[in-house]
């Protein structure tokens, strides 16, 4: 391991469409990939009238957008589906939204997902 880098070996797994996809609904996912490539965790969610609905969480393949991010934060302004990625085991347990476009002080409540 490179000093200062959080290697990702496992991520929180969640799938809202677990029945359709024939997967578990929630659990811990071991992350696989080419040995020399980095691995990350991700979270996707929707904001339906202020209510957070988690879509999926799991492992994400080598992506420079995720490098050295210990926190899972979506920065895109008002996406249809929110997405964030991070490095470090289970780093996708919590996720936040801090839009970069915002001129005024952004507000965000970190979300600790509670599967239904």
């Amino acid at each position: 391991a490179i000093l200062g880098r959080s290697e990702t070996q496992e991520c929180l797994f969640f799938n809202a469409n677990w029945e359709r996809d024939r997967t578990n609904q929630t659990g811990v996912e071991p992350c696989y990939g080419d040995k020399d490539k980095r691995r990350h965790c991700f979270a996707t969610w929707k904001n339906i009238s202020g209510s957070i609905e988690i879509v999926k969480q799991g492992c994400w393949l080598d992506d420079i957008n995720c490098y050295d991010r210990t926190d899972c934060i979506e920065k895109k302004d008002s996406p249809e589906v929110y997405f964030c990625c991070c490095e470090g085991n289970m780093c996708n347990e919590k996720f936040s939204y801090f839009p970069e476009m915002e001129v005024t002080q952004p507000t965000s409540n970190p979300v600790t997902p509670k599967p239904p």
């Epitope: 696989y32 080419d34 490539k37 991700f42 996707t44 879509v55 999926k56 799991g58 492992c59 994400w60 393949l61 080598d62 992506d63 420079i64 957008n65 895109k76 996406p79 249809e80 589906v81 929110y82 997405f83």
Partner: antibody, heavy 115, light 111 residues
């Protein structure tokens, strides 16, 4: 092993649309991006755009904005690229590739636009 | 984002070393370690050889190496072999906030 299998060759008339599919296997489809690249006969590679396979978020090359639509169906691990208002200079082999590094490629789909 | 600049062709004899350059700007090649190199044989799909400037893709011969200086990335092939004859493209990472771009390609001829 990772595989990306694309749909077969298409012949289209100018002004029509074409939709190319890319079925992924051997990895978790929703764990990366799918990029689309085309190559006109005897020419180089041209990046068209990318889709995040889990969120559906897309980014398109400026040249194709308004004419290309990238979608995916997670339930069948398949990505799609639709190009509309086809012209003769859209004749090319269209490739899908996995991830931001393009580490695995489909076999290519030849789209011929001819009147 | 404008295309990256590569020489149209290079050549070398078996056993020699050759280098292919890929020049961008300070805002793409110069700023990030996200340049990749692809090999394409006629009628085949491209194959990733080097990613992130200098990381060799799994299964790729150690005769292939990548480096970067300023706004120029380079692919070096040592101990040239007949099967290395192909087109080589440089390109950038694409996904999220990063937009992709390729070089025009370089035809490598093994004499």
């Amino acid at each position: 092993q990772v595989q990306l299998v694309q749909s077969g060759a298409e012949v289209k008339k100018p002004g029509a649309s074409v939709k190319v599919s890319c079925k992924a296997s051997g990895y978790t489809f929703t764990s990366s991006y799918i990029n689309w690249v085309r190559q006109a006969p005897g020419q180089g590679l041209e990046w068209m755009g990318t889709i995040n396979a889990v969120s559906g978020s897309t980014s398109y090359a400026q040249k194709f904005q308004g004419r290309v639509t990238m979608t995916r169906d997670e339930s069948i691990s398949t990505a799609y690229m639709e190009l509309s208002r086809l012209r003769s200079d859209d004749t090319a082999v269209y490739y899908c590739a996995r991830g931001g590094w393009f580490d695995y490629w489909g076999q290519g789909t030849l789209v011929t636009v001819s009147s | 984002q404008s295309a990256l600049t590569q020489p149209a062709s290079v050549s070398g004899s078996p056993g020699q070393s050759i280098t292919i350059s890929c020049t961008g700007t300070s805002s793409d090649v110069g700023s990030y370690n996200y340049v990749n190199w692809y090999q394409q044989h006629p009628g085949k799909a491209p194959k990733l050889m080097i990613y992130g400037v200098s990381k060799r893709e799994s299964g790729v011969s150690n005769r292939f190496s990548g480096s970067k200086s300023g706004n120029t990335a380079s692919l070096t092939i040592s101990g040239l072999q007949a099967e290395d004859e192909a087109d080589y493209y440089c390109g950038t990472f694409a996904g999220g906030k990063y937009y992709g771009v390729f070089g025009g390609g370089t035809k490598l001829t093994v004499l």
